[in-house]
Interface confidence: low
């Protein structure tokens, strides 16, 4: 990733959005009937159009399944109309591959299926810039319970339900080995308000342990999982179990690299022609690159990873095209 660039201004041939994360869009997209700027300023103060169908632009123009222009004659394409900025909440990844994003806490979650004891699990999450998951609300817990976590054939302890280490510990406060106690957040710095209900205790409890670690048991029958069926277990921290990591959402580039605050990058998603700045774990100040339609090719497919690169699908055409318009940024 490149360092933060100075303030971006729109080039000739681009319309400047008044506000929002998308800064510049191709001029033909102004007043085309499709709001692209987040504040919809590209469709404000437009002359009324009657009796005419406005052309669709960008993503609507190429059917990725067939690699050909839709809507009839390919000559309806204009010089600049292939790449388009996208709405970030729906398209852009805020988590690395394999992590699940929850908007409610701006966090990413991932289950690790290798058998680790609590402390190794905690270290693994820490190395990934996260921690064993704790929950701030019931809704967050329900989100986790509802996820379809990957299920490799040989995962640790996987049957019809799964127990996962999470970031709580149960402290025995009662005397004479009574199991009276309380849940605590395990790791310093967690300020979550949600604490689990009374736990189910491990069957084989070590007489010397005054502290037990939390396992969240998730049931993976689809019919049960969607009813949030789960239970909380207090287990020896040295037993081996799968575990759930949680980390803050982050900017992720198109090659699945995590991007640091303030850096310039192309977001993970389905548009390789966006260039944005990472701010607060989200892409901001985005500019769309301008691509020309590949010449001499009727059927083509966009490269999903490289901007303005196309694969020609014509039987007699050249296989690869680069089509970068001048003054793209």
């Amino acid at each position: 990733t490149e360092p933060l660039r100075p303030e971006l201004r729109c080039n000739p041939g681009q319309f400047a959005c008044r506000s929002g994360t998308i800064q510049c869009i191709p001029l033909p997209w102004q007043c085309d009937g499709w709001a692209t700027c987040e504040d919809e300023s590209d469709e404000a103060n437009c002359p009324e159009v009657t009796g005419e169908v406005r052309p669709h632009h960008g993503k609507e123009a190429v059917d990725p399944r067939q690699g050909r222009a839709r809507g009839g004659d390919p000559s309806h394409f204009h010089a600049v109309n292939v790449a388009q900025p996208v709405r970030f909440s729906s398209f852009l990844g805020k988590c690395p591959t394999g992590w699940h994003h929850y908007e409610g806490t701006a966090s990413c979650y991932r289950v690790y299926l290798s058998g680790e004891n609590y402390w190794d699990a905690a270290q693994t999450c820490q190395r990934l810039n996260g921690s064993l998951a704790t929950f701030s609300t019931d809704q967050e817990l329900r989100f986790v319970l509802a996820q379809e976590w990957d299920q490799p054939e040989r995962s640790f302890g996987w049957k019809d339900q799964r127990k996962l280490w999470v970031g709580y510990q149960y402290v025995i406060t009662g005397r004479n080995r009574s199991l009276e106690g309380r849940w605590e957040v395990a790791f310093k710095g967690s300020s979550e308000v949600f604490l689990p209900p009374d736990p189910i205790f491990a069957s084989a409890m070590s007489e010397n342990d005054n502290v037990f670690c939390a396992q969240l048991q998730c049931f993976h029958f689809p019919t049960l999982r969607h009813h949030d069926l789960h239970s909380w277990h207090a287990e020896s921290c040295y037993e081996k179990s799968s575990f759930l990591c949680k980390r803050s959402q982050t900017c992720v580039d198109i090659k699945d690299n995590v991007v640091d605050e303030g850096f310039y990058f192309t977001p993970k998603g389905d548009d390789p022609c966006l260039s944005c700045t990472c701010h607060g774990g989200e892409p901001e100040m985005c500019v769309a690159a301008l691509c020309e339609r590949p010449q001499g090719c009727q059927q083509y497919r966009k490269d999903p990873k490289e901007c303005c690169k196309f694969m020609c699908l014509d039987p007699d055409g050249n296989s690869l095209f680069d089509s970068m318009a001048s003054g793209m940024r």
């Epitope: 680790e116 004891n117 402390w119 905690a122 007489e207 010397n208 037993e239």
Partner: antibody, heavy 123, light 106 residues
């Protein structure tokens, strides 16, 4: 650089007391559990005691329970071991050690150790 | 001690050596391993399933099977000559160390 600098060892008579100190630097002392581990001359290692990052939880080996007290002063980045009613079998090099995991309840993995201080209990 | 180690093991320079630690508790718990050179404090080399702290060469690895934990040094170096201690929990949940293995590099 993480450093644990120990002091307070020496020769003491059976039944008497001694206090060991361990001054920490190079990490956020108040975020980690701390341990004492000892090693009798020519012998193996023996875990002695642990204290959680905020001092609220303390655990001891059976061999020292009721005689030794572990404590910490986070404002001074210092760990202590108060040893009372010392016995000949307490003769050992005593090490302070930092717990690997940043938690209220320690992992019992010791990722940094002090240089050790010799305690000799002899009449 | 409830964790049993061979008192001494030797290995030729550059060869692979495995140091073992046995105990019933190792069926449930992982061992961790410490290296101690004469007159020095111990150093954590492997903890848990097979985790190396930063600064520990990748020739050190850990594994576990049944009631036995193993520390393997692949391509032993002269500086690996030391005492090696395993530790884990015992059946009552106490933290215990093995008796130690003296490794000689020939």
């Amino acid at each position: 650089e993480v450093q644990l600098v120990q002091s307070g060892g020496g020769v003491v008579q059976p039944g008497r007391s001694l206090r060991l100190s361990c001054a920490a630097s190079g990490f956020t002392f108040s975020s980690y559990g701390m341990h004492w581990v000892r090693q009798a001359p020519g012998k193996g290692l023996e875990w002695v005691a642990v204290i959680s990052y905020d001092g609220s939880n303390k655990y001891y080996a059976d061999s020292v329970k009721g005689r030794f007290t572990i404590s910490r002063d986070n404002s001074k980045n210092t760990l202590y071991l108060q040893m009372n009613s010392l016995r000949a079998e307490d003769t050992a090099v005593y090490y302070c050690a930092k717990d690997l995991t940043r938690s209220g309840y320690p992992s019992y993995y010791f990722d940094y150790w002090g240089q050790g201080t010799l305690v000799t209990v002899s009449s | 001690s409830e964790l049993t180690q061979d008192p001494a093991v030797s290995v030729a320079l550059g060869r692979t050596v495995r140091i073992t630690c046995q105990g019933d508790s190792l069926r449930s718990y992982y061992a961790s391993w410490y290296q101690q050179k004469p007159g020095q404090a111990p150093v954590l080399v492997i903890y848990g399933k097979n985790n190396r702290p930063s600064g520990i060469p990748d020739r050190f690895s850990g594994s576990s099977s049944g009631n036995t934990a193993s520390l393997t040094i692949t391509g032993a170096q002269a500086e690996d000559e030391a005492d090696y201690y395993c530790n884990s929990r015992d059946s009552s949940g106490n933290l215990v160390f093995g008796g130690g293995t003296k490794l000689t590099v020939l």
